[in-house]
Interface confidence: medium
């Protein structure tokens, strides 16, 4: 699948041809003269994110599969790993190391020829959009944010589940049923379908040949690769189908006509009882199997289709992924399931996204509807935090309640706090902790969304196993939240890892925005902080020197936050006093690169630490840069 990340890693190479077949590669090498060491790179048609290297030697073409390792490196089976396909080719131009000869001359794409996109590519964007829309019932900004923040995960999800949307995939039907379906209508040789055999990822390919239905087992190996016995291995079913549609390669014949899912005609429709199809199934278009699919229907997770006996399910209807597990909310990633995404959580959308939950006109909440737990979750500059439960119109929402210190009860602060709370209550983005409202009771209480895993710095201190990919994902989410605040003309003023809370290990939210302003936390407040906890270390020079706060000063703080994250929650400028930090910055010195932190991320930190406000990037630029790097790394 030429995902954006894969395209980035090879599309720029003039000798990369994209999704061409082995035969097409050989034709190109013949065009190039078939001299020893002539080579080209193409996209693997059986491994997601992988490549194939086609090399001429002795007037013959030799093909090597380049697999993409889990850590994002590339290797020819049994060979050494390389950071990119380009590096691998460069290495083999000096060392044959298992290849038939050295790579001597790249065969570059003829003028006007672009790398060929796979059949899945054209569909991918639409599939992702539809999947997100229908799976999580999102629209508008929530939909866009979901697609941006989770694109790599969604691409993988779509790639590995795309077969479920294909007309040739019939879910878990019996061998007998599959034969009946194949034999209905036209008796074209090569007509086929794929059915699921069991819950462990085993399938069967049912192929019509001379009036007989042949059944080929498709097994999944330990690494998740799919193959017919003794056959070529593939990452996905659609890649397997695509391959056997142009090459028999062990089958009695090539696949020609997909046997339509009962009840569908051109479109994929995953519901209802089966209708007998007409005798004119969809033709196998030149554009490949997948490009014929025009519309999709995804079930809602948790939507109960039926509850047949566990372990012995008889499917009388053909539905989307008939053996899909039904999962309880507490276990959204249970079973042979994907990882929980931010959209799976209760706090991705505003509690008021449900039209029946009417947003109160007042920012005030009824204290009687709020229940607090005894134990404190934590305490910060502004007070203590407790877990609570707020009775909304339809549901009881788990909330975090910030109980402000008594000085916040100063009547002079009341208007300011209320005004700020009114603004904060209007802010609505998946990557900020939404404020549900405030209560005036024993103390001022701010009622906010709950983020169970707590502050980012503490979490990383205690979980050193978190990979840098995961950290990039989290800081990217923070940049998305900050981009939203910037667009809303809202300045955080206290952005730091302690004020980023985790909902899950893969979902971050910004908290405590605007509180420093609302509670008049001026220079005196900061000077009153205990030594070593001064937010000065997160402050841009113009904040320290002139008390000038802006979204650009938040960008500086974001750079420090990134440093904290890649340092696994270490304190910035450790052991230094505020005045020493200021002097260091004035000299043009900056904190060093955290151990193991990718160079690109440290470069971005330094960009955030641009002394001059005018030249410092805004969050729109920071988010885009992070996004591109994140996609590249994750893919």
């Amino acid at each position: 699948m030429a995902s954006s990340g894969m395209a980035d890693s090879a599309n720029h190479l003039p000798f990369f041809f994209g999704n061409i077949t082995r035969e097409e590669a050989e034709d190109y090498l013949v065009q190039g003269g078939m001299s020893d060491g002539l080579y080209l790179l193409r996209q693997s048609r059986n491994y997601l994110g992988g490549f194939a290297l086609s090399v001429a030697h002795g007037r013959k073409a030799h093909h090597y599969t380049i697999e993409r390792e889990l850590n994002g490196t590339y290797a020819i089976a049994g060979g050494r790993t390389h950071a990119s396909p380009a590096d691998l080719c460069h290495y083999h131009s000096q060392e044959s190391d298992g290849l038939v000869c050295l790579l001597k001359k790249p065969f570059n794409r003829p003028q006007g020829v672009q790398p060929k996109t796979g059949p899945f590519e054209d569909l991918k964007e639409n599939l992702i959009r539809e999947y997100v829309k229908q799976t999580w019932n999102l629209q508008g900004q929530a939909l866009e944010q979901a697609i941006i923040s989770q694109k790599p995960q969604l691409e993988k999800l779509i790639a590995t589940t795309a077969h479920e949307k294909m007309p040739w995939f019939h879910g878990k039907i019996s061998r007998e049923e599959s034969e009946q379906i194949v034999l209905i209508g036209s008796k074209t040789n090569g007509k086929f379908l794929i059915r699921a055999r069991d819950n462990n990822g085993s399938y069967a390919l049912c192929l019509l040949h001379e009036g007989k239905v042949l059944h080929y087992r498709i097994d999944k190996d330990k690494t998740g690769k799919l193959s017919i016995p003794e056959g070529k291995k593939f990452d996905t079913l659609w890649q397997l189908v695509e391959h056997y549609s142009y090459k028999a390669d062990g089958l009695l014949r090539v696949l020609t006509v997909p046997c339509q899912k009962i009840g569908t005609q051109g479109n994929v429709n995953f519901g209802g009882r089966p209708q007998l199809p007409g005798s004119h199934p969809a033709t196998w278009s030149a554009g490949g199997i997948i490009s014929r699919i025009k519309s999709y229907s995804f079930p809602k997770p948790g939507h109960r289709k039926s509850s047949p006996a566990q372990g012995n399910r008889q499917e009388s209807t053909v539905s989307f992924n008939p053996y899909e597990p039904e999962l309880a909310p507490w276990a959204a990633d249970k079973g042979p399931q994907r990882e929980a995404l931010p959209m799976d959580t209760e706090v991705y959308e505003s509690p008021y996204a449900d039209p029946e939950e009417i947003r109160p006109k007042e920012v005030y909440l009824d204290r009687k509807l709020l229940t607090l737990e005894d134990k404190e979750l934590g305490s910060g500059n502004f007070g203590t935090v407790k877990k609570g439960y707020y009775q909304m119109k339809k549901v009881v929402k788990t909330v975090a309640v910030k109980i402000l210190k008594n000085e916040a009860n100063d009547p002079a602060l009341k208007d300011e706090l209320l005004a700020e709370a009114n603004v904060m209550q209007q802010l609505d983005n998946p990557y900020i902790v939404r404020m549900i409202g405030i209560c005036e009771a024993e103390s001022w209480m701010l009622v906010m969304e709950m983020a169970e895993l707590g502050p980012l710095n503490k979490y990383l201190q205690q979980n050193r196993h978190v990979k840098d990919k995961n950290i990039i994902e989290l800081v990217h989410q923070v940049s998305m939240g900050m981009k939203y605040l910037e667009e809303s003309n809202f300045v955080h003023r206290d952005l730091a890892a302690r004020n980023v809370l985790l909902v899950t290990q893969h979902y971050a939210k910004i908290s405590d925005f605007g509180l420093s302003k609302a509670l008049r936390a001026d220079e005196n407040y900061y000077k009153a902080q205990t030594h070593g906890k001064w937010p000065v270390k997160w402050y841009a020079p113009e904040c320290i020197n002139y008390y000038k706060f802006s979204s650009k000063s938040d960008v500086w703080s974001f750079g420090v936050l990134m440093w904290e994250a890649f340092s696994y929650g270490q304190k910035p400028y450790r052991g230094m006093k505020g005045s020493e930090v200021t002097a260091m910055l004035e000299k043009g010195e900056r904190m060093g690169c955290p151990a193991g932190c990718p160079r690109e991320m440290y470069d971005l930190m330094n960009l955030c630490w641009t002394y001059d406000v005018e030249n410092r990037p805004g969050f729109a630029a920071v988010e885009l840069r992070l996004r591109n790097y994140y996609y590249d790394v994750v893919n």
Epitope: Q310, A328, P329, K334, G335, P336, Q505
Partner: antibody, heavy 119, light 106 residues
Framework: EVQLLESGGGLVQPGGSLRLSCAAS????????MSWVRQAPGKGLEWVSG????????YYADSVKGRFTISRDNSKNTLYLQMNSLRAEDTAVYYC????????????WGQGTLVTVSS | DIQMTQSPSSLSASVGDRVTITCRAS??????LNWYQQKPGKAPKLLIY???SLQSGVPSRFSGSGSGTDFTLTISSLQPEDFATYYC????????FGQGTKLEIK
């Protein structure tokens, strides 16, 4: 045939530690979430902890949070429960159980291992 | 936490009887309810999942019903091997079990 075999139980003093293991066979271990459930002598069942299939999300009952750690090694088909700061009230038979695909019923259980916390 | 309350806590019945055990959740749990049977010295066994679905291999005399907060396990005609303790368990949020119902021979 699905089999779950717990080990590692025994007598331990209050404040001590113990590590339970559960060896799984007969199914694709990495595809299923797993749980630990305990039963104090003569008492009912109490869910202790759970862990997801591939991404190792962990869940704990309040009574053990901060003291017990669930983990798994998919390459070894083994589930673990590290129990620290043990108390007398942790005395129980500990069962490991597979979380079924459908609505999270605990569809297969081990025979249990007895943990006794006493001075 | 969601509290699960079973009733009765014990009951006596004879072979051939129809027996009903109820389970109430302290808040709505949709259909996230499972029923287990446990015999002395043995591990529990899943009977019913998703409130009403019979686990594979479990005799059809066992049935479950209910949704929301009130659930019922019914044994249509008691067999000698059915005398045991029965537990309900919710899996809507972190799992919790009922206190158990001991079914004894009359």
């Amino acid at each position: 045939e699905v089999q779950l075999l717990e080990s590692g139980g025994g007598l331990v003093q209050p404040g001590g530690s113990l590590r339970l293991s559960c060896a799984a066979s007969g199914f694709t271990f990495s595809s299923y979430a797993m749980s630990w459930v305990r039963q104090a002598p003569g008492k009912g069942l109490e869910w202790v902890s759970g862990i997801s299939s591939g991404y190792y999300y962990t869940y704990y009952a309040d009574s053990v949070k901060g003291r017990f750690t669930i983990s798994r090694d998919n390459s070894k088909n083994t589930l673990y429960l590290q129990m620290n700061s043990l108390r007398a009230e942790d005395t129980a038979v500990y069962y490991c159980a597979r979380v079924g695909w459908y609505w999270n019923g605990l569809d297969y259980w081990g025979q249990g291992t007895l943990v006794t916390v006493s001075s | 936490d969601i509290q699960m309350t079973q009733s009765p806590s014990s009951l006596s019945a004879s072979v051939g009887d129809r027996v009903t055990i109820t389970c109430r959740a302290s808040q709505s749990i949709s259909s996230y309810l499972n029923w287990y049977q446990q015999k002395p010295g043995k591990a529990p066994k899943l009977l019913i999942y998703a409130a009403s679905s019979l686990q594979s291999g479990v005799p059809s005399r066992f049935s479950g019903s209910g949704s929301g907060t009130d659930f019922t396990l019914t044994i249509s005609s008691l067999q000698p091997e059915d005398f045991a303790t029965y537990y309900c368990q919710q899996s809507s949020v972190l799992p919790t079990f009922g206190q158990g119902t001991k079914l004894e021979i009359k």
